[in-house]
């Protein structure tokens, strides 16, 4: 059976991407 | 109502190739930042690789496990993403979840590694 | 790689009743720009993760305001103002600020 994430609309939902960096860059080893 | 789909998954053998496919629907597709997430027992949940969008030149990230064995692409005009793994190993076996960016999640696709 | 590490591996937590979970990252989450991109998923049995909040405290759309994310830099907390039955689940933690992604491993929360 199919998960479903989101709220439900008759248009599209607009994805969040402000839970990731924009411009990533690696993680330095301490 | 927002969807994302996953397929392609089963068995494979070490060293085999599997191609995964996400379908996604009521969202904007083209603007979202796709992901590739694994889920395993052992390691638990495992970025695989990431592509962004047309502004951002489809720039793609992998883990470093998988560089150079896996390939992920997009079609924005069927609002699909892809997961094209060759390679494959033993520790590569896991529920795989394409998400928009970490915020909406698919139901996940069962890959299974082994002879 | 940055290590998310969460506390406590698992909780009981009476129905109404508040709950605290603890990530803390071995690095500073804090990007350039000035946000910093920690988020919190819930895993409800049998499904898929969902996103809860982004940006330490940001709530996405639709999540119960009873959830609540506060920190900076390295240590971070989700609460839950009063636990709903709704509620049980892993909830984890998740760093967005460098490659690669990586993810706490969990805090299961059952319901007393």
């Known amino acids: 059976s199919e998960t479903t994430t989101g709220t439900s609309s008759n248009s599209s939902q607009s994805t969040s991407n402000s839970g990731l960096a924009p411009n990533p860059t690696n993680a330095t080893t301490k | 109502e927002v969807k994302f789909e996953e397929s392609g998954g089963g068995l494979v053998q070490p060293g085999g190739s599997i191609k995964l496919s996400c379908a996604a629907s009521g969202v904007t597709f083209s603007e979202a930042w796709m992901d590739w997430v694994r889920q395993s027992p052992e390691k638990g949940l495992e970025w695989v690789a990431e592509?962004?969008?047309?502004?951002?030149?489809?720039?793609?990230y992998y883990a470093e496990s998988v560089k150079g064995r896996f390939t992920i692409s997009r079609d924005d005009s069927k609002s699909r993403v892809y997961l094209q793994m060759n390679n494959l190993r033993t520790e590569d076996t896991g529920i795989y979840y394409c998400t928009g960016a970490m915020d909406y999640w698919g139901q996940g696709t069962s890959v299974t590694v082994s002879s | 790689d940055i290590v998310m590490t969460q506390t406590p591996l698992s909780l009981s937590v009476t129905i109404g009743q508040p709950a605290s979970i603890s990530c803390k990252s071995s690095?500073?989450?804090?990007?350039?720009?000035?946000?910093?991109?920690l988020n919190w998923l819930q895993q409800r049995p049998g499904q898929s993760p969902k996103r809860l909040i982004y940006q330490v405290s940001k709530l996405d759309p639709g999540i119960p305001d009873r959830f609540s994310g506060s920190g900076s830099e390295t240590d971070f907390t989700l609460k839950i103002s009063r636990v709903e039955a709704e509620d049980l689940g892993i909830y984890y933690c998740?760093?967005?600020?460098?490659?690669?992604?990586?993810f706490g491993g969990g805090t299961k929360l059952e319901i007393k």
């Open positions: 690095q500073s989450l804090l990007y350039s720009n000035g946000k910093t991109y």
């Open positions: 592509i962004r969008d047309k502004p951002n030149s489809y720039v793609t």
């Open positions: 998740m760093q967005g600020t460098y490659l690669p992604w990586t």
